[in-house]
């Protein structure tokens, strides 16, 4: 099931998903001046068997100007290039997502893709805050935001960050560690089924993560 | 639950132009790619474009392009396909469909629509 | 890109096996299909080549790969009296729709 949302927006923070589960969508977008090709692939899906997840379809932008000039590349994911995902820019791979079952790594970079990619996320879904440059965190609880399915609906959980204005010399001076509940709030629904899948693994992996796997600059 | 209703038959005279509507409810709209898919009396389904009514983003088969225009309008959660110079090959049932990223899960009931003079 | 089927119409009894096949014009890392039934919408039946949407029975079967692809019926009963059609997700394109009938 897609959720019907976009993750939460926390002011001074930007959140990146580890890894999207099987099902998760991006759109196909193509920076100014730049179309999809003819025909071309409207989003990329990932999906795979048991053993292993890919991303299906492929992005290719061509300039709205010419007819014929197809523009594409496909690199490794060690030739990744920076670029904003969603609202937070992944130059690099924290852990090996391609050993997470049922979910795909970052989709590498296609030429003149669009500024910011425009992912359709699925329950069960966990993605990861941090401050902006400039500004450090307070947590009070897990900084991480999960897609569940409550009575039929979907909603994402409330990350427990805040993010103030302090300048540091470090980005995050004395911050404790995640905790490992997925939960960032309590919830007064408990008499009905909450729809989630792989919270323990994606939080034993959130554990493991280092801060300096988001890089602070944005466009 | 999810459901797409499409405007009632059309008969068109050649050259016209014809719209048909695609009211979505029980799904959040703006979230899903929304397809529009032909079929001619006894033939094969034939997709014809898409919009993504999020940022109102189209795509279009070669085929059609330069005569189907596709549109949404989030606010009544509705799509639009208009298929202009209409001719006699257009005579089919066109139906719009959701786009659950592996396959179209739900489907309008279908429009016929008659190109005859 | 073009899919192209085989049989076009296909009689066959109940209990029977059956194979339909799609052969894309391009290689494709994925096939969907569809069944329809007269005067009816569609309706996704297999979908990443041997994946069964919600509510088909399980003598339906997807496989293949590359440009060559099947789907099977294991014992054919009435109610899978359809036509079928594979779908290539990439280029949205169909194939000409497999006819099955029931002597």
């Known amino acids: 099931e897609l959720c019907d949302d976009d993750p939460p927006e926390i002011p001074h923070a930007t959140f990146k998903a580890m890894a999207y589960k099987e099902g998760t969508m991006l759109n196909c977008e193509c920076k100014r001046g730049f179309r999809r090709i003819k025909s071309g692939s409207l989003y990329m899906l990932c999906t795979g068997n048991s053993s292993h997840s890919s991303w299906d379809n492929q992005c290719q932008c061509t300039s709205s100007a010419t007819r014929n000039t197809t523009k594409q590349v496909t690199p490794q994911p060690e030739e990744q290039k920076e670029r904003k995902t969603t609202e937070m820019q992944s130059p690099m791979q924290p852990v090996d997502q391609a050993s997470l079952p049922g979910h795909c790594r970052e989709p590498p970079p296609w030429e003149n893709e669009a500024t910011e990619r425009i992912y359709h996320f699925v329950v069960g879904q966990m993605v990861y805050y941090q401050c902006v440059q400039g500004y450090r965190a307070l947590h009070r609880g897990p900084a991480e935001s999960v897609c569940k399915m409550t009575h039929g609906k979907t909603r994402w959980t409330q990350p427990q960050l805040i993010c103030t204005g302090e300048m540091e010399t470090s980005q995050f001076p004395g911050e404790e560690k995640p905790q490992a509940s997925p939960e960032g709030r309590p919830e007064s629904e408990t008499s009905c089924l909450v729809t989630t899948t792989d919270f323990q693994i994606q939080t034993e992996m959130a554990a493991t993560m280092e801060t300096s796997i988001f890089t602070t600059e944005y466009q | 639950q999810v459901q797409l209703v499409q405007s009632g038959a059309e008969v068109k005279k050649p050259g016209a132009s014809v719209k048909v509507s695609c009211k979505a409810s029980g799904y959040s709209f703006t979230r899903y790619w929304m397809h529009w898919v032909r079929q001619p009396p006894g033939q094969r389904l034939e997709w014809m474009g898409a919009?993504?009514?999020?940022?109102?983003?189209?795509s279009y088969s070669q085929k059609f392009e330069g005569r189907v225009t596709i549109t949404a309008d989030t606010s009544a959660s509705t799509a639009y396909m208009e298929l202009s110079s209409l001719r006699s090959e257009d005579t089919a049932v066109y139906y719009c469909s959701r786009d659950y990223g592996y396959y179209f899960d739900f489907w309008g009931q279908g429009t016929t629509v008659t190109v005859s003079s | 890109i073009v899919s192209t089927q085989s049989p076009d119409t296909q009689s066959v009894t109940p209990k029977e096996k059956v194979t339909i096949t799609c052969r894309a014009s391009?290689?494709?890392?994925?096939m969907q299909w569809y069944q329809q039934k007269p005067d009816q919408s569609p309706k996704r039946w297999i979908y990443?080549?041997?994946k069964s949407a919600s509510g088909v029975p399980s003598r339906f079967s997807g496989s293949g790969s590359g440009t060559d692809y099947t789907l099977t019926i294991n014992s054919l009963e009435a109610e899978d009296a359809a036509t079928y059609y594979c779908h290539q997700r990439s280029s949205y394109t169909f194939g000409q729709g497999t006819k099955l009938e029931i002597k």
């Open positions: 919009i993504y009514p999020g940022n109102s983003d189209t």
């Open positions: 391009s290689s494709r890392s994925y």
């Open positions: 990443d080549t041997s």
